[in-house]
Interface confidence: low
């Protein structure tokens, strides 16, 4: 399986909400011994490998934000902890999963990584990640709504996140 990031760059004004999205592609084993963890964390663009460094998002670790289920099942994070930090991660039946960040501040700018870990009991984990940049802007040059830039082309698309 692979992870696709529909948008590689999100440019948002301070105070806005944004939903960062990843999509799980390819055949997904729904066997009883297969577990999927989907999660999010902050990182930096390392020399060797993007997303190799794991940093918390608003003090929540990748474990606080993880979704745990089999196959393409829907799931949500522990609401209380995440929502206290203005965060919510979610997953649907079609392989889409996302993290929503509310009331953005300049400190939220940076590289975000989504991670899918396939665990087969008695076997090693297989992990695939996707990366995207979030730029939070303030002042007169900031957009009125989030502007997202697709990963596959340079065209931008205005959305209200």
């Amino acid at each position: 399986f692979k992870v696709a990031t529909p948008y590689s760059l999100y440019v948002c004004p301070e105070g806005q909400n944004v939903t960062l999205t990843c999509r799980l592609l390819g055949p997904v084993d729904k066997g009883h011994d297969v577990t999927f963890y989907k999660t999010w964390y902050r990182s930096s663009r390392g020399e060797v490998q993007t997303c190799s460094e794991r940093r918390p998002i608003r003090n929540l670790t990748f474990q606080d934000l993880h979704l745990h289920h089999g196959g393409h099942q829907a799931a949500n994070t522990s609401h209380d902890l995440a929502q206290r930090h203005g965060l919510e991660s979610a997953s649907d039946h079609h392989g889409n999963f996302s993290i929503t960040m509310r009331n953005l501040t300049l400190l939220d700018s940076g590289l975000y990584c989504c991670l899918v870990v396939e665990i087969r009991h008695h076997h090693s984990e297989h992990r695939v990640h996707g990366a995207m940049e979030l730029q939070v802007q303030t002042g007169k040059d900031a957009p009125s709504n989030c502007v997202v830039y697709p990963s596959s082309s340079q065209d931008s698309e205005n959305i209200t996140a």
Epitope: Y37, T61, Q63, V117, H121, H123, S124, E125, H126
Partner: antibody, heavy 121, light 108 residues
Framework: QVQLVESGGGVVQPGRSLRLSCAAS????????MHWVRQAPGKGLEWVAI????????YYADSVKGRFTISRDNSKNTLYLQMNSLRAEDTAVYYC??????????????WGQGTLVTVSS | EIVLTQSPATLSLSPGERATLSCRAS???????LAWYQQKPGQAPRLLIY???NRATGIPARFSGSGSGTDFTLTISSLEPEDFATYYC?????????FGQGTKLEIK
């Protein structure tokens, strides 16, 4: 920086028990699976056991299954190996090693310096 | 259980020479879940290569890994004096994890 410090080794008689500890520092212990790996004098490396980050799953080498128990206390950043019914062939340096895996298991990216266990009458 | 066989058992070379170490698995190691470690006498092993071909943090570029399936190779392009040690391959494809018996790289 990441540090793993093993303790609890020593000389023990066959059939007796011993508990090894591994104190971890310099990283978020509760985010990583952990392993014990051993090396008999002059021999190669042998994987012993793994425990997942939250203790939910444990797996053992056949040679120690039913005799050794791996456990962890995330509040104390400590990994344990309870060794019962010890045999002469358990004599080895025991290393604790951090797994690079996010949840379950992957390769070992950091190792302790080891503690020697000698089983002898 | 996946059995890993390393060859040669001992390799005698001089500094500046190229070293090629082999690791063969008894069954296919999917996703190239194979690592290489270096161990010097009295020391703990050190991770060199993971996922068959990725250098670990801080490992010099003279170390490289290759291979897939059942045949894997560790290459040291130009030996430095500090490279003389014992090298182990390890699979993390399935439990029980297994190591090769090691290749001792000694100074000729």
């Amino acid at each position: 920086q990441v540090q793993l410090v093993e303790s609890g080794g020593g000389v023990v008689q066959p059939g007796r028990s011993l508990r090894l500890s591994c104190a971890a520092s310099g990283f978020t212990f509760s985010s990583y699976a952990m392993h014990w790996v051993r090396q008999a004098p002059g021999k190669g490396l042998e994987w012993v056991a793994i425990i997942w980050y939250d203790g939910s799953n444990k797996y053992y080498a056949d040679s120690v299954k039913g005799r050794f128990t791996i456990s962890r206390d995330n509040s104390k950043n400590t990994l344990y190996l309870q060794m019962n019914s010890l045999r002469a062939e358990d004599t080895a340096v025991y290393y604790c090693a951090r797994d690079s895996g996010f949840y379950s298991s992957y390769y070992f990216d950091y190792w302790g310096q080891g503690t020697l266990v000698t089983v002898s009458s | 259980e996946i059995v890993l066989t390393q060859s040669p058992a001992t390799l005698s070379l001089s500094p500046g020479e190229r070293a090629t170490l082999s690791c063969r698995a008894s069954q296919s190691v999917s996703s190239s879940y194979l690592a290489w470690y270096q161990q010097k006498p009295g020391q703990a092993p050190r991770l060199l290569i993971y996922d068959a071909s990725n250098r670990a943090t801080g490992i010099p570029a003279r170390f490289s890994g290759s291979g897939s399936g059942t045949d894997f190779t560790l290459t040291i392009s130009s030996l430095e004096p500090e490279d003389f040690a014992t090298y182990y391959c390890q699979q993390y494809n399935s439990y029980p994890y297994t190591f090769g018996q090691g290749t001792k790289l000694e100074i000729k």
